[in-house]
């Protein structure tokens, strides 16, 4: 018998510790950093992944501003507070009692304040625009082939319901993937667009979160699609609240 048969791993999250101590001795995996039990049949929430990643380099992601309500993450990595379901808590604070409010993908959406700062609710990021530039190729990709391949990727690799991939735009060498998911649209068991975007971002950077699976090998009609830069724009259901000086 192979030793691999006799141990536990989490196919969807390698940043876990797993052992057969779940109900009935089933495999149970806990996220590093938080010890929270994760469901390995789906993506792990970004909050738990960020918590597990705290020892990683600082340049987590870059955000740009498509309109006056979009957020840019100038703060880099931080050790987030997650709720029992693994979602970001609306209010985040650092060790020096500086606090701020975040959206559902953990990006700051208010000015920083002190412990008296109130964040009444976790505001949902309902629209994500993933902006990619691919490396030069002999010719442009066929738009419909590219569209189909990216939709397949989000459905099969990230388990995101196809209805949440709103559009795939292409103007060589720029590809834009639009993800949309309102609170009312997200049913129990649905993968969150924020988590899918985070897994995709890590894949594109060659930092796959999947256990033992090869890195992302994107091909359109057999032609490799190699991404050379990624920008992700986040839009919240309620516009952020920053003072004018920002």
């Amino acid at each position: 018998h192979t030793a691999a048969q006799d141990n536990c791993t989490c196919p969807t999250n390698k940043m876990t510790v797993c052992s057969p101590d779940g109900p009935g001795g089933r495999c149970q995996c806990r996220a590093l950093g938080s010890g929270v039990a994760v469901d390995c049949s789906t993506l792990t929430s970004e909050c738990l992944l960020l918590k597990a990643r705290m020892s990683a380099p600082k340049n987590a992601r870059t955000l740009v501003r498509p309109n006056e309500h979009a957020l840019v993450d100038n703060d880099g990595l931080y050790d987030p507070d997650c709720d029992p379901e693994g979602r970001f808590k609306a209010r985040q604070c650092n060790q020096t009692s500086v606090c701020w409010c975040v959206n559902s993908v953990g990006v700051r959406r208010t000015d920083k304040g002190d412990l008296s700062l109130r964040c009444d609710e976790l505001v949902r990021t309902h629209h994500i625009l993933i902006d990619l530039r691919h490396r030069p190729t002999a010719g442009a990709f066929n738009h419909s082939d590219l569209d189909a391949e990216l939709r397949r990727l989000f459905r099969e690799r990230y388990r995101l319901h196809p209805k949440f991939v709103a559009a795939v735009h292409y103007e060589q060498p720029t590809i834009q993937i639009e993800l949309r998911q309102n609170t009312s649209q997200k049913a129990a068991g649905d993968v969150d667009i924020g988590d899918a975007a985070y897994y995709f971002e890590r894949d594109v950077k060659g930092e796959s979160l999947f256990q033992g699976r090869g890195g992302l090998d994107l091909r359109v009609r057999g032609e490799p699609l190699q991404v050379e830069r990624t920008l992700i724009y986040y839009l919240d259901e309620i516009p952020p609240k920053f003072s004018m000086k920002r």
Partner: antibody, heavy 115, light 112 residues
Framework: EVKLVESGGVLVKPGGSLKLSCAAS????????MSWVRQTPEKRLEWVAS???????YYPDSVKGRITISRDFARNILYLQMTSLRSEDTAMYYC?????????WGQGTLVTVSA | DIVMTQSPLTLSVTIGQPASISCKSG???????????FNWLLQRPGQSPKRLIY???MLDSGVPDRFTGSGSGTDFTLKISRVETEDLGVYYC?????????FGSGTKLEIK
Amino acid sequence: EVKLVESGGVLVKPGGSLKLSCAASGFTFSDSAMSWVRQTPEKRLEWVASISRGDDTYYPDSVKGRITISRDFARNILYLQMTSLRSEDTAMYYCTRDRFGFAYWGQGTLVTVSA
Amino acid sequence: DIVMTQSPLTLSVTIGQPASISCKSGQSLLDSDGKTYFNWLLQRPGQSPKRLIYLVSMLDSGVPDRFTGSGSGTDFTLKISRVETEDLGVYYCWQGTHFPFTFGSGTKLEIK
């Protein structure tokens, strides 16, 4: 050597309550998932309750609300609290240590529910 | 609930001869985590059940290698290459992939 010793099984009237105990030794109790399994007089085996390492509890619908699994880490004892007992709860109750299933079994304690 | 159907109900075997027990589940036991939570247990007369095999084919420590577990999905088999006296008793299959966990009704192995 893993050792599980159940106790507390008695004759009880329908509607009554009972608390079973299982003394565990020979392994790290706090790191282990544990369960209770019962065997009816007809020799049918039935899963009754499980508790994970993180102390999450799991029950089949047939006993939910009437049965509670818990443990005492200081004394290395697993418990099964049973209330509103019925004649169909009559069985030999086994405590198990779990690893990919019910890996180790105790000798059992007999619970008889009868008027 | 997942029904585990064992066959035969009784198996009469001569010492030294092979034996085979089947267990079929009402649904695939392959879990989303890639594991198949399927066990074989033996309850000797007057004793508690004892696990022989877990994850379909993995032998528990101290279990003789004349026992072999195989199968996948919904069909599982326990084979004993040469039956010995200590093998008599009731064999149960178990699934832990779906809640609630369920057992087969048992196969009684008796010596001919």
